[in-house]
Interface confidence: medium
């Protein structure tokens, strides 16, 4: 499932290239392994901003698919409780390109530990 999440992220990158979306998104660019689930949930929440800002049906579909896949993969990890992690609003705001790059990195972290 995480591999499919990566391919959906790459598709979103492809689709937004031709658009001008100047939204900034809360981004965890240095994820600590003990906070990766919390960070992933922030990424998934912020991803919906791209869907809304783009107004593009194909992006909306891909975001929707990605969220289902990622939540499904997260739930297979069991109910992990993490403490001492940053709230989404405490994270640095970055542009969409940087946000997606950081998102790919955190997904790769999940792939490497699964």
């Amino acid at each position: 499932n995480w591999v499919n999440v990566i391919s959906d992220l790459k598709k979103i990158e492809d689709l937004i290239q031709s658009m001008h979306i100047d939204a900034t998104l809360y981004t965890e660019s240095d994820v600590h392994p003990s906070c990766k689930v919390t960070a992933m949930k922030c990424f998934l929440l912020e991803l919906q901003v791209i869907s809304l800002e783009s107004g593009d049906a194909s992006i909306h579909d891909t975001v929707e698919n990605l969220i289902i896949l990622a939540n499904n993969s997260l739930s297979s990890n069991g109910n992990v409780t993490e403490s001492g992690c940053k709230e989404c609003e405490e994270l640095e705001e970055k542009n969409i390109k940087e946000f997606l790059q950081s998102f790919v990195h955190i997904v790769q972290m999940f792939i490497n530990t699964s």
């Epitope: 598709k11 891909t62 698919n65 289902i68 939540n71 499904n72």
Partner: antibody, heavy 116, light 107 residues
């Protein structure tokens, strides 16, 4: 893996509505988006739209906008596709399937015949 | 909408033959292309996604290639169970359109 079981064949008159059900079993209901694809007799495949069983969010092909409604009942792990204002060219096998942009598992199909 | 054109629309081949089906998109779809196999009276089955990735459980005699607008599905050595209709589908832009299908028949 998930199994999708669809409701039985329907015969409808032009102008009527049809509601096809798709019940998921085997895997978690919320693990997959559900798409609907139809196939007219002897013809190719046509993508109609999708539903997220978790949120209830939907995305419909422009062609069916205003005529199609996708809903779900989480208590029975069932997704529904309702098509209104039926015409003869809506005669087809309607499939539910998992995924949006890549369709993995398919239901067995439901034949909907529109005839006066 | 993106148009998907498959060729040929049908072909006759023998067991053991190498079979190639092509699919052309009306605009650049990068690698967002899926291939499905459908047997009479049955639901389609996903064979290949992302142009070249084999779906789990699909025999290695099936392969896909291409990117942009031109794509190919190859069956390296046709088996009796491969006689079916094959569809390509673009998953780049909604609505996710299918090709008209290629029927592979026994010669």
């Amino acid at each position: 893996q998930v199994q999708l079981v669809q409701s039985g064949a329907e015969v409808k008159k032009p102008g009527a509505s049809v509601k096809v059900s798709c019940k998921a079993s085997g895997d978690t209901f919320s693990s997959y988006a559900i798409s609907w694809v139809r196939q007219a007799p002897g013809q190719g495949l046509e993508w109609m739209g999708w539903m997220n069983p978790n949120s209830g969010n939907t995305g419909y092909a422009q062609k069916f906008q205003g005529r199609v409604t996708m809903t779900r009942d989480t208590s029975t792990s069932t997704v529904y596709m309702e098509l209104s204002s039926l015409r003869s060219e809506d005669t087809a096998v309607y499939y539910c399937a998992t995924g949006i942009t890549m369709i993995g598992y398919w239901g067995q199909g439901t034949l909907v015949t529109v005839s006066s | 909408d993106i148009q998907m054109t498959q060729s040929p629309s049908s072909l006759s081949a023998s067991v053991g033959d190498r079979v190639t089906i092509t699919c052309q998109a009306s605009q650049d779809i990068s690698s967002y292309l899926n291939w499905y196999q459908q047997k009479p009276g049955k639901a389609p089955k996903l064979l290949i996604y992302a142009a070249s990735t084999l779906q789990s459980g699909v025999p290695s005699r099936f392969s896909g290639s291409g990117s942009g607008t031109d794509f190919t599905l190859t069956i390296s050595s046709l088996q009796p169970e491969d006689f079916a209709t094959y569809y390509c589908q673009q998953s780049y832009s909604t609505p996710y359109t299918f090709g008209q299908g290629t029927k592979v028949e026994i010669k």
